[in-house]
C-alpha cells in the first residue's frame, strides 16, 4: 500500500492503489547538498548525478571507528524521498548531489557556501530549466550563509531547507532563518509536530510550512535494493523539494514568490496540534502541512496572499518591529500584535522603494510584532493614504479617493500611551467600503491599490465585550487581504490573518476584571481578481 | 522569516582601533563587523569568511586577500587563503589566527567577517 507520507501529500483525486500523480517533475533539476550517496541504489539509479563537488571537514575524534560504507545513509535516503522510483515524491525529477557533509553528517558554513557558489557557476555555464536546491542541514544563525541563499534565490533558484531538529525557534538557525529560503518543519502520521528524542522539529515564524518527517520510508545505503525508515526535518524538506519540482514542471515560469504562495495555498490548514509548540510560538508558527495541488494546470486565477510576522521588537519604549514582503509581492495590509496589549499600533511606510509594515511598542509593553499581508498582484499600483488624528468624537477616517483604487487594508498608529483611557469611536457607518475608521487619537492609514479586475469588500464581526478572540473569514473565492480591529483600545492585543480568517485577540474580561461594555469588532477586507480569473479561463 | 536587522542570537563585535598604517581606512562612517556562532560547540575558530562589499570585483577580492597575507606576515603570522568567492558573494575564506581580526576588519572593501562554524544533517 501507499506509504502514509505519500498519501498525506496527495490530493484525493490521485489516491489509488499506488501514488501516481501526473508529471513527475521531469523538467526540473534538484540539487542535493548532503552526505555522499549510493547512486547505484535501484531507487535512484539513473536519476541522480554525483557531481565532483566535495567540501567536508575531517571526522571528529580519534576514538571514532568510521565505517566508510555507511557514509551514504542520509543523502541516499533523501534522494530517494525526492525522486525515488517507488517511494519518491517527484519520480521524474533528476538530481545532482554535492557532498558537503562528512560521514558523521557534519559540514561547515564555508563548505556549504562554496557548494552554493558551485551551483550558481554551473547554472551560468549551462542554463537548464527550473532549479531546486535542497539543503537538509542546519547550523547556528549565519549572516553569510543567509546572504548567499538570498543571492542564489534572486538568481531564480528555489531553495528548500530543513527547519532543524532542536525543538527551538527556527530563526536561530541557518539557512532556516533566511527569508528567501522555503523552510520546512516536520509532522507525523497524526499531523502532530515530530518529536525526536528529547527534542523535535523547530517551529516559529521562520518556518514556512510543515511536511511529513517521521517514519519516512526511503532508500537505504545498506544494499542497492534496501529500504529504511528515517525521521527528521530533512525528510520533511525533501517532500517539499519534490512537491516544488512537480509544481515547477507543470508551470516552469513560476517565480519563487509564486511557488511559495502556491505551496502555502495548497497545504492542509489547521491540522497540527499547536499545544506541542511553546505558548509564545503558537501564533507565529504556520499551521500548514504541505500537499500537491489538485490539478496540474496552474491556479493563476487565484489571488494568493500569505502572512509574514516580524521579529519581536523587544521591550524598550520606542522599540519597533518591521515585517517585509518578498520583492515580487505587494504589501496589501499591515497589523500589529502585543501579548501585553501595550502597543501604539502600526503603519505602512516606504523603505528602499518598497512598502514595509512597522509596529510600535508602548511604554510598559513587553514588545510588539508587525504582521504583513503579502500578496501576488500583477500590475498592481498601491499607495498609502494617511489621515492624522481627528481629535473629534467620530474618530479618524480615511478612504481611497483615486479613481479605480480599492481598499485592501487599514492600519492605525497612535502616540498616546493608552487608547483605553479615551472614549472609543463610533463604528463606521455601513455602505462605505473604501474607508478606514479608527480612534480619534490615532492616525489612520489606508492601503489603496489599483490592479486589473481587483475588487474588494469589507466584512465585520463584532461581539459585545472582549472574550479573548473575535474572528471573521472571507468566503470561498475571496482572499483575505486586510485584517484589523475596531476599536483600537487597550483591550485589543492586536489583529492578524490566519489563512483566510481575520483574528482579533483581546484580553478576556473575565480574567482582567474589567466591566467595559464596549464591542470588539474584527474587520476583514476580502478581495478577488476578475482579471486573473478571466485570464485563467482564456488559457484553458 | 528572519529580518536582516532582526535581533538574532549571535555575537557581533565591531572591532575598532587606531589606524593601521599599512591598511587603507574603510569608507568613512562604516565599521566592518565580526560575527560568530552563538553555540560554542559549533564554532570553528581559526577559519574566517571575509565578506566584501557588494560590488567588489574578483580582482579586488584577490588583492584584498593578498594584502591581508602581507600585513599578517609583517606581524609574524602565517595565513592561508583557502578560497576566493565570486559568483554569489565577493570575499574569501582564510585560515588565520583570531589575533588578526582587528587588522582584517580595517581592510578596504570589507563588509563583515564571519568565523566559520559547523552545520549538521537534520
Amino acid at each position: 500500500s501507499i506509504p502514509w507520507n505519500l498519501e498525506r501529500i496527495t490530493p484525493p483525486r490521485y489516491r489509488a492503489d499506488e501514488y501516481q500523480p501526473p508529471d513527475g517533475g521531469s523538467l526540473v533539476e534538484v540539487y542535493l547538498l548532503d552526505t555522499s550517496i549510493q547512486s547505484d541504489h535501484r531507487e535512484i539509479e539513473g536519476r541522480v548525478m554525483v557531481t565532483d563537488f566535495e567540501n567536508v571537514p575531517e571526522e571528529d575524534g580519534t576514538r571514532f571507528h568510521r565505517q566508510a560504507s555507511k557514509c551514504d545513509s542520509h543523502g541516499t535516503h533523501l534522494a530517494g524521498v525526492v525522486s525515488g522510483r517507488d517511494a519518491g515524491v517527484a519520480k521524474g525529477a533528476s538530481m545532482r548531489s554535492l557532498r558537503v557533509l562528512n560521514c558523521q553528517g557534519k559540514g561547515t558554513v564555508s563548505g556549504t557556501l562554496i557548494g552554493l557558489e558551485f551551483i550558481r557557476k554551473s547554472q551560468l555555464v549551462q542554463p537548464v530549466g527550473p532549479l531546486v536546491v535542497l539543503l537538509p542541514l542546519a547550523g547556528g544563525y549565519s549572516r553569510v550563509l543567509n546572504a548567499a541563499c538570498q543571492r542564489l534565490a534572486r538568481a531564480g533558484v528555489v531553495l528548500v531547507t530543513a527547519a532543524g531538529n532542536f525543538r527551538d525557534d527556527a530563526c536561530l538557525y541557518s539557512p532556516a532563518s533566511a527569508p528567501e529560503v522555503i523552510t520546512v518543519g516536520a509532522t507525523n502520521a497524526q499531523d502532530q509536530p515530530v518529536t525526536l528524542g528529547t527534542l523535535g522539529t523547530n517551529f516559529g515564524r521562520c518556518v514556512d510550512l510543515f511536511a511529513p518527517g517521521e517514519d519516512i520510508i526511503g532508500a537505504s545505503s545498506d544494499c542497492s535494493t534496501c529500504f529504511v525508515s528515517q525521521s527528521g526535518t530533512s525528510q520533511a524538506a525533501a517532500h517539499v523539494a519534490g512537491i516544488a519540482a512537480m509544481m515547477l514542471s507543470a508551470e516552469p515560469e513560476l517565480t519563487l514568490a509564486e511557488l511559495r504562495q502556491r505551496l502555502i495555498h495548497f497545504s492542509a490548514k489547521d491540522v497540527i496540534n499547536e499545544a506541542w509548540f511553546p505558548e509564545d510560538q503558537r501564533v507565529l508558527t504556520p499551521n500548514l502541512v504541505a500537499a500537491l495541488p489538485p490539478s496540474t494546470h496552474g491556479a493563476g486565477w487565484q489571488l494568493f496572499c500569505r502572512t509574514v510576522w516580524s521579529a519581536h521588537s523587544g521591550p524598550t519604549r520606542m522599540a519597533t518591529a518591521i515585517a517585509r514582503c518578498a520583492p515580487d509581492e505587494e504589501l496589501l495590509s499591515c497589523s500589529s500584535f502585543s501579548r501585553s496589549g501595550k502597543r501604539r499600533g502600526e503603519r505602512m511606510e516606504a523603505q528602499g522603494g518598497k512598502l514595509v509594515c512597522r509596529a510600535h511598542n508602548a511604554f510598559g509593553g513587553e514588545g510588539v510584532y508587525a504582521i504583513a499581508r503579502c500578496c501576488l498582484l500583477p500590475q498592481a499600483n498601491c499607495s498609502v493614504h494617511t489621515a492624522p488624528p481627528a481629535e473629534a468624537s467620530m474618530g479618524t477616517r480615511v478612504h481611497c479617493h483615486q479613481q479605480g483604487h480599492v481598499l485592501t487594508g487599514c492600519s492605525s498608529h497612535w502616540e498616546v500611551e493608552d487608547l483605553g483611557t479615551h472614549k472609543p469611536p463610533v463604528l463606521r457607518p455601513r455602505g462605505q467600503p473604501n474607508q478606514c475608521v479608527g480612534h480619534r487619537e490615532a492616525s489612520i492609514h489606508a492601503s489603496c491599490c489599483h490592479a486589473p479586475g481587483l475588487e474588494c469588500k469589507v466584512k465585520e464581526h463584532g461581539i459585545p465585550a472582549p472574550q479573548g478572540q473575535v474572528t471573521v473569514a472571507c468566503e470561498e473565492g475571496w482572499t483575505l487581504t486586510g485584517c484589523s480591529a475596531l476599536p483600537g483600545t487597550s483591550h485589543v492585543l492586536g489583529a492578524y490573518a490566519v489563512d483566510n480568517t481575520c483574528v482579533v485577540r483581546s484580553r478576556d474580561v473575565s480574567t482582567t476584571g474589567s466591566t467595559s461594555e464596549e464591542a470588539v469588532t474584527a474587520v476583514a477586507i476580502c478581495c478577488r481578481s476578475r482579471h486573473l480569473a478571466q485570464a485563467s479561463q482564456e488559457l484553458q | 522569516q528572519e529580518d536582516e536587522d532582526g535581533d538574532y542570537e549571535e555575537l557581533v563585535l565591531a572591532l575598532r582601533s587606531e589606524e593601521d598604517g599599512l591598511a587603507e581606512a574603510p569608507e568613512h562612517g562604516t565599521t566592518a563587523t565580526f560575527h560568530r556562532c552563538a553555540k560554542d560547540p559549533w564554532r570553528l575558530p581559526g577559519t574566517y569568511v571575509v565578506v566584501l562589499k557588494e560590488e567588489t570585483h574578483l580582482s579586488q577580492s584577490e588583492r584584498t586577500a593578498r594584502r591581508l597575507q602581507a600585513q599578517a606576515a609583517r606581524r609574524g603570522y602565517l595565513t592561508k587563503i583557502l578560497h576566493v568567492f565570486h559568483g554569489l558573494l565577493p570575499g574569501f575564506l582564510v585560515k588565520m589566527s583570531g589575533d588578526l581580526l582587528e587588522l582584517a576588519l580595517k581592510l578596504p572593501h570589507v563588509d563583515y567577517i564571519e568565523e566559520d562554524s559547523s552545520v549538521f544533517a537534520q
Epitope: 571514532f64 568510521r66 557514509c71 545513509s73 560521514c103 527534542l199 517521521e214 537505504s220 | 560547540p41 549538521f120
Partner: antibody, heavy 123, light 112 residues
Amino acid sequence: EVQLVESGGGLVKPGGSLRLSCAASGFTHSSYSMNWVRQAPGKGLEWVSSISSSSSYISYADSVKGRFTISRDNAKNSLYLQMNSLRAEDTAVYFCARDYDFHSAHYDAFDVWGQGTMVTVSS
Amino acid sequence: ESVLTQPPSVSGAPGQRVTISCTGSSSNIGAGYDVHWYQQLPGTAPKLLISGNSNRPSGVPDRFSGSKSGTSASLAITGLQAEDEADYYCQSYDSSLSGSVFGGGTKLTVLG
C-alpha cells in the same frame, strides 16, 4: 509503545565471550543512535559504547576498547554487543538505551532504556 | 573514578529542598555540552529526569529542576517526598573521550 528489550546475558568464565542483543520497537530505530551502559553490582552507571544511526560512527569506553564490538541491524530493529576476552570487572547489568542521532550537533539524553540483562564473569 | 563528580550522598526531611551538584571540566560541561539527569529507583532501570540542562520530560513533577553554569550543573528537588529516595546520576558528552560520561551517582535519603 516505545520499548527496548535486552537479552543474551548469563554466566561466563574469564576470557570467554558473550553476545548481547537489544530489540527495539515502537519508534524509527534507524534515526536513533544506540548505546550500551553497564552497572556493576552496587556501583554507578558506566557508558560502554555508542553506535550512530547508520553505523558510520562507533565509539567505546577505554575499559572495553579492543574487546567489545557494537553493531546494529536497522532492518531487524536490533542492537548487539559482542563481548570477548571477558574479565571479572565486566560483571554488571547491561542496559541498552537510545538517543536521537543529531549528527554530533547535540548529544541527547538517553530517553528510553531497556530493563537490563545481567552478565556475570566468574570462574 | 568518574569524569563528572557528584557527592556520594545527600539527605533531607520530607518537604525540604535538596540540591545535587555535578562538576565537570572544559572538555565536557564547560565545552557547552548539555547535562542530563537520571533517577534510578532500587532494582530498576534509570529513568530520564532532566534533559538539556533544565528540561523536564512529560510526567516528571515540577519539583525537579536542573541548571547549568560554567563547568558544573545541579539538580534541585523541592518538597521532598519519600518516593524521591533513589540514586541520581548526571551525564554529559566529553569531546576528549569522544563519548558519554556519567557522574558517580548520588544516593538521596529522605529522612524520617
